[in-house]
Structures are given as C-alpha cells and as structure tokens.
Amino acid sequence: IPPHVQKSVNNDMMVTDNNGAVKFPQLCKFCDVRFSTCDNQKSCLSNCSITSICEKPQEVCVAVWRKNDENITLETVCHDPKLPYHDFILEDAASPKCIMKEKKKPGETFFMCSCSSDECNDNIIFSEEYNTSNPD
C-alpha cells in the first residue's frame, strides 16, 4: 500500500490479501426483509432492486427465506462471515452461488444461504441437486 494511503490500526475497512493488495468489497442485493411469493420452487429471484456496496470488504452476500402461518419473507443483506447471523454460522460463505440450507427455528420454516460473488443473493437456490457434495 503506498505510503500516502494511511493504514489505520484495527481497521476492517481496509482488508488486504497475502500480497498486501487491498480487497474490493462485495456487491450484494440489500433489501433487508421483504414479503415474498417464493414458495415450492427450485430457485427464486430476490425481486430486490437495490444492489449495495458492502460496507466492509470481508462481508459476503446473505439471503434468508422464512415461512410461517401468516407470510413468507426474504431478507437480503451483506454480512461478515466471521460473525453469526440469526444465530447461525455462515458455513457456505465462499460459495459463488446462494444454495439455501434449512435451519431449525421453532414456529417457522427457515432457510439461509451465503455466497461471495457479485449479487449472488439475487438468485436463491433450493434444489436438492446443488446441496449434494460436488466432487469437482
């Protein structure tokens, strides 16, 4: 990093790779929680028109699909994979695709996915064929 660009102590806005190059942040769909019509489909589009620059370069894209007796919602955000989200670890943060995995939540059906390519939480995938381990 050139000397005129200050590197702040304990600053997570400036994330560098092993070569000292600064990482670009992720671009993610970011509509927070919205009502959704996505149900019983192999995959869905988020219908979120807002693509945001994630605040910190280490953040990834996240989508959370929830269904209860009253409604279905889809949440799209950026989040740091080192921190839990809705009390769950983002296990699949390095994936280029947002492959939904069911999580146990009382009183509702709860699926969550995370991914690390631009706007990858725009297309959320429920299909079982993606959830099996890929030998490649």
């Epitope: 990093i1 050139p2 790779d17 070569n19 190059a21 600064v22 990482k23 670009f24 992720q26 671009l27 620059i53 370069p57 280029p96 390519s117 631009d118």
Partner: nanobody
Framework: EVQLLESGGGLVQPGGSLRLSCAAS???????RMWWVRQAPGKGLEWVS?????????YYANSVKGRFTISRDNSKNTLYLQMNSLRAEDTAVYYC?????????????????WGQGTLVTVSS
C-alpha cells in the same frame, strides 16, 4: 496500463456540491469497473461508488445513496463523482480505483498505480 489522476476537491460548506474527476491514461480504461474510494482523517478506506464499463450500471454505499452520482465518459477516459448535499462526515481524501475484468470481477485491488487523491473538506 491505466494510470489515474484525481482532481476537483476543495473546501465546501455543508449542503454544498463538488464534482470530482479522475483522468485515466492508457487505452484499456473501457475494460475496467471503476470505483471511488475515500479515506477520512485517521480512518480506513470507505468504498463509495462503482460503475460498470459497459452499460454504466452504478452502485453506491448506503452512506452516500441519493446524494452522490458516479458517471464515466469512456471517450475521454474520465471518471466523475458528483457530490451534492455534502456533510461534514464526507470530509476525506477521495481516490479512484480500477477493478480488473475477469470471469468474475477480481476481488483484489491491482495497485499498479495510486494517485495522490483529492482532498474534500466540508466545513462552515
């Protein structure tokens, strides 16, 4: 190689406007996603805005949405940032950066050149 030179900064009162420019030398400007990045005194980098090379789709940080507008003129190899309704917290050195193309956009900043940036001070 694309080299970058920022200009247009200065002192402006809160609520005022400024337009920053980033002049790129080199013939490959049209291949790059371009960014504006800022660094406030004693703080880290904040990624402000980005624009695609083709179609010119734009992206903004939540902190500047609705106030800043990024644009580019590929025929002039120039990137712009129109900043309106400026606030004290917008005070920073503003840099432009290029993001290399690829199958998916490279996530590391190719630091082959940094300009000195341009200082924006918002104060009454």
């Amino acid at each position: 190689e694309v080299q970058l030179l920022e200009s247009g900064g200065g002192l402006v009162q809160p609520g005022g406007s400024l337009r920053l420019s980033c002049a790129a030398s080199g013939s490959t400007f049209t291949e790059y996603r371009m960014w504006w990045v800022r660094q406030a005194p004693g703080k880290g980098l904040e990624w402000v805005s980005a624009i695609e090379p083709i179609g010119h789709r734009t992206y903004y940080a939540n902190s500047v949405k609705g106030r800043f507008t990024i644009s580019r003129d590929n025929s002039k190899n120039t990137l712009y940032l129109q900043m309106n309704s400026l606030r004290a917290e917008d005070t920073a050195v503003y840099y432009c950066a290029k993001q290399a193309p690829g199958e998916k956009w490279a996530r590391r900043w190719d630091l082959d050149y940094w300009g000195q940036g341009t200082l924006v001070t918002v104060s009454s």
